[in-house]
Amino acid sequence: AGVFELQIHSFGPGPGPGAPRSPCSARLPCRLFFRVCLKPGLSEEAAESPCALGAALSARGPVYTEQPGAPAPDLPLPDGLLQVPFRDAWPGTFSFIIETWREELGDQIGGPAWSLLARVAGRRRLAAGGPWARDIQRAGAWELRFSYRARCEPPAVGTACTRLCRPRSAPSRCGPGLRPCAPLEDECEAPLVCRAGCSPEHGFCEQPGECRCLEGWTGPLCTVPVSTSSCLSPRGPSSATTGCLVPGPGPCDGNPCANGGSCSETPRSFECTCPRGFYGLRCEVSGVTCADGPCFNGGLCVGGADPDSAYICHCPPGFQGSNCEKRVDRCSLQPCRNGGLCLDLGHALRCRCRAGFAGPRCEHDLDDCAGRACANGGTCVEGGGAHRCSCALGFGGRDCRERADPCAARPCAHGGRCYAHFSGLVCACAPGYMGARCEFPVHPDGASALPAAPPGLRPGDPQRYL
């Protein structure tokens, strides 16, 4: 038994062009958290449960708000380690998935929205009890720096946490053939129950007399390294030192298969045999299943009962993406017609329509004049989604129901007096002015500014406005 520990050092933009935009904004502050999933890297093992070695979720990091215009910095991280306890032997080779999640802290319907920012996967060889191993992984434009280690929980010790330590029976030294338990020097290694001669470094046992090998080792006592290249390779010159043929360049050189996949040559190229939990041409895709809980924001995981069948997330309205990690800004599609205001309520879109329009998307232009009578001989005019009455002379108001006082607006200029008349208004102009609204001065020599006075009217006569 023991604990796998993961320490995230930084998460931020990777080197090179195309720096990612900050995942948080002043409008949508957010915080990060991480998820780690561990699987044993024994490719020959039968179908194991997802995250068979265990999984862990970090605490939420500090709330972060983007500084406008600034490039995305390394983002503030949660405190502490991610710890994944393991009950049995440490397998020596393991595969990991580390996900970086963003929790949006805006006003969310149905709780905070989670979205997957980055997912990295890898396969590593690691002995328990060793020092921290440092790693850098890139996912798109993001870069994750982290360290990890596996440590045994007392009384277990060794590279696989399978040897047991017991308190010393004598104060000075351990019994015959038994070593002190580093780093617990005051304890002694318990008598080995594995098969005699089983390699303490590369073998372990869970039953007395057994010798099971860590990946990369074989033989009855786990002392023989598994050969990575055959000495029967037909390519290249013979090596004098080993008697083996040194392979020349081939499609599998440098092993193009990621995550511990094994490469085999084909007539045209190569083929990767991927360990369970990974797939793709180069085993670059991690085989997450529904049991790993890949669907966020209330998404339902469909299919994907095992790593060989892909899962699909059915996303609730308002979310999209392969993991329902993206909030849909449905108003950005401008669904409301005729100037309607768009409201995204989470479960539905609402359009607030301008006067004169109706329908779910304000698509119906109401007949503004339908059923609207303009009184006193007025006529209805449609326009801009609102009805208007053009009133007959002497009437006004929205529906032409008000008798108009034509003199209310003081239409006669230069001190002229206004008289209401059955056909409109009449201005009696002050001396020196003339015109329908007394707008024209009469010249001192008796000529007016008008080309000619209308017949029957002398300058100074009341002017009737027609």
């Epitope: 209330g298 059915h314 609730p316 309205p317």
Partner: antibody, heavy 118, light 108 residues
Framework: QVQLQESGPGLVKPSETLSLTCTVS????????WSWIRQPPGKGLEWIGY???????NYNPSLKSRVTISVDTSKNQFSLKLSSVTAADTAVYYC????????????WGQGTLVTVSS | EIVLTQSPGTLSLSPGESATLSCRAS???????LAWYQQKPGQAPRLLIY???SRATGIPDRFSGSGSGTDFTLTISRLEPEDFAVYYC?????????FGGGTRLEIK
């Protein structure tokens, strides 16, 4: 107020197709997933399947070969067809709305009893 | 599929007492995607709890949900006469959506 109303024949002959319709009021059928659930007399609840207005469907594997759920957005309705029925399909059939926060059921119809008998 | 097992099958209590209903999943339910419903005779089920612990709109605070992973609990404190009914749990983590077999809460 969201309301769902199931309609359809209460009696279906064995080997025939059971057809039910759910009429929704108070909510747009285009804004939610919609589901069918059934309950044999005196027994527990069994999810049949759901549909989204876009045409996305998901059915219970135990019934998948016999089930079709469709949607009519113009009528704000969705429908269930269950073929080759037997007496074991006798149940109260409920239509329900799937919530926004996840695939659980926040509004239910009152249910309609369908008896399979010759 | 995730099989949900509810216990006890029947629970006999008196008004004013507290009821504890259990729902156990055959596999871990991610993100606590679990809901509880109440069903009275001749009626459709009514949503009580979602997300394992969030009360649905209009549900009195004497109903509370808890748990995570594979073990979930519905607690009804101070039982009222109208609380005697059948209660179902439902997981919505993955397809197919599944319900528990139900717990009948009856008056002692």
């Amino acid at each position: 107020q969201v309301q769902l109303q199931e309609s359809g024949p209460g009696l279906v002959k064995p080997s025939e197709t059971l057809s039910l319709t759910c009429t929704v009021s108070g909510a747009s059928i285009s804004s939610f997933y919609w589901s069918w659930i059934r309950q044999p007399p005196g027994k527990g609840l069994e999810w049949i399947g759901y549909i989204y207005y876009s045409g996305t469907t998901n059915y219970n594997p135990s019934l998948k070969s016999r089930v079709t759920i469709s949607v009519d957005t113009s009528k704000n309705q969705f429908s269930l067809k269950l073929s080759s029925v037997t007496a074991a399909d006798t149940a109260v059939y409920y239509c329900a709305r799937i919530a926004v926060a996840g695939f659980f059921f926040d509004y239910w119809g009152q249910g309609t009893l369908v008896t399979v008998s010759s | 599929e995730i099989v949900l097992t509810q216990s006890p099958g029947t629970l006999s209590l008196s008004p004013g007492e507290s009821a504890t209903l259990s729902c156990r999943a055959s596999q871990s339910v991610n993100k606590n995607y679990l809901a509880w419903y109440q069903q009275k005779p001749g009626q459709a089920p009514r949503l009580l709890i979602y997300g394992a612990s969030s009360r649905a709109t209009g549900i009195p605070d004497r109903f509370s949900g808890s748990g995570s992973g594979t073990d979930f609990t519905l607690t009804i404190s101070r039982l009222e006469p109208e609380d005697f009914a059948v209660y179902y749990c439902q997981q919505y983590d993955r397809s197919p959506l599944t319900f528990g077999g139900g717990t009948r809460l009856e008056i002692k």
